[in-house]
């Protein structure tokens, strides 16, 4: 049977290093990597292996490595971002942007630079909504249609269809009746008076509430580690 | 299979400044060093040092510091000697070699430094 | 550095008879359970070609006419038989700390 070889050796022509071993191109040799968290201290000779050591407070290392210095993690999160990944020895701190923000400027992870979602202000209604990653678009309420809030997430709904009308409706303010009832009203039980800006019409998607903890989806997937912890060697 | 292939051969005067290529193949370029080797006329092989190609860090044996420099183009997993201020007695082929221990060579590369 | 010494500087073999180049080393090349001299070839106006790594190690595509043995300070590469094709410089190379050294080479040719 072939014997195991122990890190340091050296490869056959035409071989690789083995999984988590790298290939050292001055002892010329396969090597251990260190593992993920800690970061090489030593690099191997002929005759000694890799040394590792851990990885210094606010620093980390994500992969197996051979890397002379763990990498810094990210300054702290800034007031219009959340921390949703604490930086320890084997991951960077993820800072992702609070609900109505998105990121203007995305980082490998997470997101350098946050901005408040645009809102649409009264006759304009939310056209395609924002997301992590992009702004809200507005577009002007047509015909038939108002938004009489500046929000970013109302969209443009209908007036209401009155029996007599009172105040046409424009893109800004709902149609008023003058009979006791409308013949449709969008939200059963509306008064039919112009709606108060808190108002909601039931077509408008609810926003979550302050305290609902970000989805999973919410966050922006891994991304490649640096360069300088890939492997070469296998 | 593993190749390295040389820029053909120069005929330079003395002062002047070469520059050789050697293009890798066969295999991921910035796994393995690159060490370069002289051979003059009528003498023995001598070894001028290496490059790491991973971190294009250069290391020159003793006789060879100076007017000599490595370098790479990793994205076209290429190696380069460069000899400034020519003289007479860099008269020589050059091989590139595959550091891996044992070397892989390249076919060589002929200088001719003459007035 | 580590000094090659290789013998003889010239060999004439007879074709069919065994041709041997030996290799000394001023120190020793080995480290980790290995010797770290290998043997090249060089025909006349050509580059190397890696003919033994690792002292004792054919590589891929040499005719097993060619081996190499020894430790530490003293390494033979032999040819048995040898062929009209053999003709040509060999060389040692160790590896074992930097710089590279090399031998200075055996001219074989064919009597």
């Known amino acids: 049977p072939a014997q195991v070889a122990f890190t340091p050796y050296a490869p056959e022509p035409g071989s690789t290093c083995r999984l988590r071993e790298y290939y050292d191109q001055t002892a010329q040799m396969c090597c251990s990597k260190c593992s993920p968290g800690q970061h090489a201290a030593v690099f191997c000779t002929k005759t000694s292996d890799t040394v590792c050591d851990s990885c210094e407070d606010s620093t980390y290392t994500q992969l197996w490595n051979w890397v002379p210095e763990c990498l810094s993690c990210g300054s702290r999160c800034s007031s219009d971002q959340v921390e949703t990944q604490a930086c320890t020895r084997e991951q960077n701190r993820i800072c992702t942007c609070r609900p109505g923000w998105y990121c203007a400027l995305s980082k490998q992870e997470g997101c350098r630079l946050c901005a408040p979602l645009r809102k649409c202000r009264p006759g304009f209604g939310v056209a395609r909504p924002g997301t992590e990653t992009s702004d809200v678009v507005c577009k002007p309420c047509a015909p038939g249609t108002f938004s009489n809030t500046t929000s970013s997430t109302d969209i443009c709904r209908p007036h209401q269809i009155c029996n007599v009308v009172a105040i046409p409706g424009n893109a800004s303010m709902d149609a008023v009746c003058t009979s006791t009832s409308p013949t449709r009203s969008m939200a059963p039980g509306a008064v039919h008076l112009p709606q108060p800006v808190s108002t909601r019409s039931q077509h408008t998607q609810p926003t979550p509430e302050p305290s609902t903890a970000p989805s999973t989806s919410f966050l922006l997937p891994m991304g490649p580690s640096p360069p300088a912890e890939g492997s070469t060697g296998d | 299979q593993i190749q390295l292939v040389q820029s053909g051969p120069e005929l330079k005067k003395p002062g002047e400044t070469v520059k050789i290529s050697c293009k890798a193949s066969?295999?991921?370029?910035?796994?393995?060093?690159m060490s370069w080797v002289k051979q003059a006329p009528g003498k023995g092989l001598k070894w001028m040092g290496w490059?790491?190609?991973?971190?294009?860090?250069?290391t020159y044996a003793d006789d060879f510091k100076g007017r000599f420099a490595f370098s790479l183009e990793t994205s076209a997993s290429t190696a380069y000697l460069q000899i400034n201020n020519l003289k007479n007695e860099d008269t020589a082929t050059y091989f590139c070699?595959?550091?891996?221990?044992?070397?892989?060579w390249g076919q060589g590369t002929l200088v001719t430094v003459s007035a | 550095d580590i000094v090659l010494t290789q013998s003889p500087a010239s060999l004439a073999v007879s074709l069919g008879q065994r041709a041997t180049i030996s290799c000394r080393a001023s120190?020793?090349?080995?480290?980790?359970?290995?010797?770290?001299m290998h043997w090249y070839q060089q025909k006349a106006g050509q580059s190397f070609k890696l003919l033994i790594y690792r002292a004792s190690n054919l590589e891929s595509g040499i005719p097993a006419r060619f081996s190499g043995s020894g430790s530490r300070t003293d390494f033979t590469l032999t040819i048995n038989p040898v062929e009209a094709d053999d003709v040509a410089t060999y060389y040692c190379?160790?590896?074992?700390?930097?710089?590279?050294?090399f031998g200075g080479g055996t001219k074989l040719e064919i009597k």
């Open positions: 490059i790491n190609t991973y971190s294009g860090v250069p």
């Open positions: 066969g295999y991921t370029f910035t796994t393995f060093g």
């Open positions: 190379q160790q590896s074992n700390e930097d710089p590279w050294t």
């Open positions: 120190e020793s090349v080995d480290s980790s359970g290995n010797s770290f």
């Open positions: 070699a595959r550091r891996s221990n044992f070397a892989y």
